[in-house]
Interface confidence: medium
């Protein structure tokens, strides 16, 4: 069954590099028979020089958001990391509540875009703790 | 645009194989994990198998765990799936899906037929 | 193991709105919100609708939109019309061992 750490799927509100988003050392997914590097690439060299002449589209296989082409941001999906697209106004968003606790995540999601932050929903304030729905609202 | 092309279904008898092949073109398949899901006659969907971009790292559905192994040849850009020890509760379409944000590319699959 | 579960038929007429459930348990859609939609018409593929709950990819009508409460996901799809009859189904993801599930699929109806 799912671990409870995906009850909270998504990076820190920040961009990268801060975000964790951004291929940091510590920052693979490792599952299966994936140890330390992305899917047994040398996380150094082998992806970088061999995959990404071109900026990955969404859902293509990154190490860091500047692998990814504008608009998204490379977050952890699965197994990999993957460009996702950073997030538009509205959309859900989630905000750690206590450092570290993004570590054991396997799906992250991106940052809010320019000019949005990631706070609790209006209509979510009576919600419990663990259930409050954050979304990205404009400052 | 992003095309997945299946081939290599068709009728063959329980205890049987079979090995499907699906071919990609339209984006870079050697940076996108790629599955397999299917759909029995009138049924539901099921995923069947997922493989990471470089072949390396390979899931599976318990139901067909130890019968079917998933594979990929990034310089063919096509995705395999070989089917040993096929049942009859095997038959079904079989759909081969990018894994980028979610099963977010399918193919239009190709039938499997296990029955003697 | 995870099971999704959804209304086996909805219907609807045109220009209304629908929305097709998707229930689970803790450890799934309620604990863990990561889930996707598809569309499937008779006889063709299906077709990625909503992922992570509420975000329509490119190209995907604004008509569809997702959302989640507790342990249920929902598809509402709004100004319901002809070519929206299908087959939709919601799918969320295991990790041990790491697995697609998908839920059993709704027959959507378009009256009329």
């Known amino acids: 069954t799912l671990n409870s750490v995906l009850n909270s799927n998504a990076i820190k509100n920040l961009p990268p590099p801060l975000g964790g988003a951004a291929g940091h050392p510590g920052s693979a997914v490792s599952f299966g028979n994936d140890h330390s590097t992305l899917d047994g690439y040398s996380r150094r060299t082998t992806l970088s020089s061999k995959m990404y002449h071109t900026k990955g589209q969404e859902g293509s296989v990154c190490l860091r958001s500047s692998d990814c082409a504008s608009g998204l941001c490379c977050a952890r999906h699965f197994w990999s990391k993957i460009c996702k697209p950073v997030l538009k106004e509205g959309q859900v968003c989630t905000k750690h509540r206590r450092k570290g606790s993004h570590g054991l995540e396997i799906f992250q999601r991106c940052y809010c875009g320019e000019g949005l932050s990631c706070r609790i929903q209006k209509d979510h304030h009576q919600a419990s703790n663990s259930s409050r729905l954050h979304t990205c609202q404009r400052h | 645009q992003v095309q997945l092309v299946e081939s290599g279904g068709g009728l063959v008898q329980p205890g049987g194989s079979l090995r499907l092949s699906c071919a990609a073109s339209?984006?870079?398949?050697?940076?996108?994990?790629m599955s397999w899901v299917r759909q029995a006659p009138g049924k539901g969907l099921e995923w069947v198998s997922g493989?990471?971009?470089?072949?390396?790292?390979?899931h599976y559905a318990d139901s067909v765990k130890g019968r079917f192994t998933i594979s990929r040849d990034n310089s063919k850009n096509t995705l395999y799936l070989q089917m040993n020890s096929l049942r009859a509760e095997d038959t079904a379409v079989y759909y081969c899906?990018?894994?980028?944000?979610?099963?977010?590319?399918w193919g239009q699959g190709t039938l499997v037929t296990v029955s003697s | 193991d995870i099971a999704l579960t959804q209304p086996a038929s909805v219907s609807g007429s045109p220009g209304q709105s629908i929305t097709i459930s998707c229930t689970g348990t803790?450890?799934?859609?309620?604990?863990?919100?990561?889930v996707s939609w598809y569309q499937q018409h008779p006889g063709k593929a299906p077709k990625l609708m909503i992922h992570?709950?509420?975000n329509r990819p490119s190209g995907v009508s604004n008509r569809f939109s997702g959302s989640k409460s507790g342990n249920t996901a929902s598809l509402t799809i709004s100004g319901l019309q002809a070519e929206d009859e299908a087959d939709y189904y919601c799918?969320?993801?295991?990790?041990?061992?790491?697995?697609?599930?998908f839920g059993g699929g709704t027959k959507l109806t378009v009256l009329g």
């Open positions: 803790s450890s799934d859609v309620g604990g863990f919100n990561y």
């Open positions: 899906a990018r894994m980028g944000i979610d099963l977010d590319y």
């Open positions: 493989i990471s971009y470089s072949g390396s790292n390979t």
């Open positions: 339209g984006f870079t398949f050697s940076s996108y994990w």
């Open positions: 799918q969320s993801w295991d990790v041990s061992p790491i697995t697609a599930v």
């Open positions: 992570d709950g509420s």
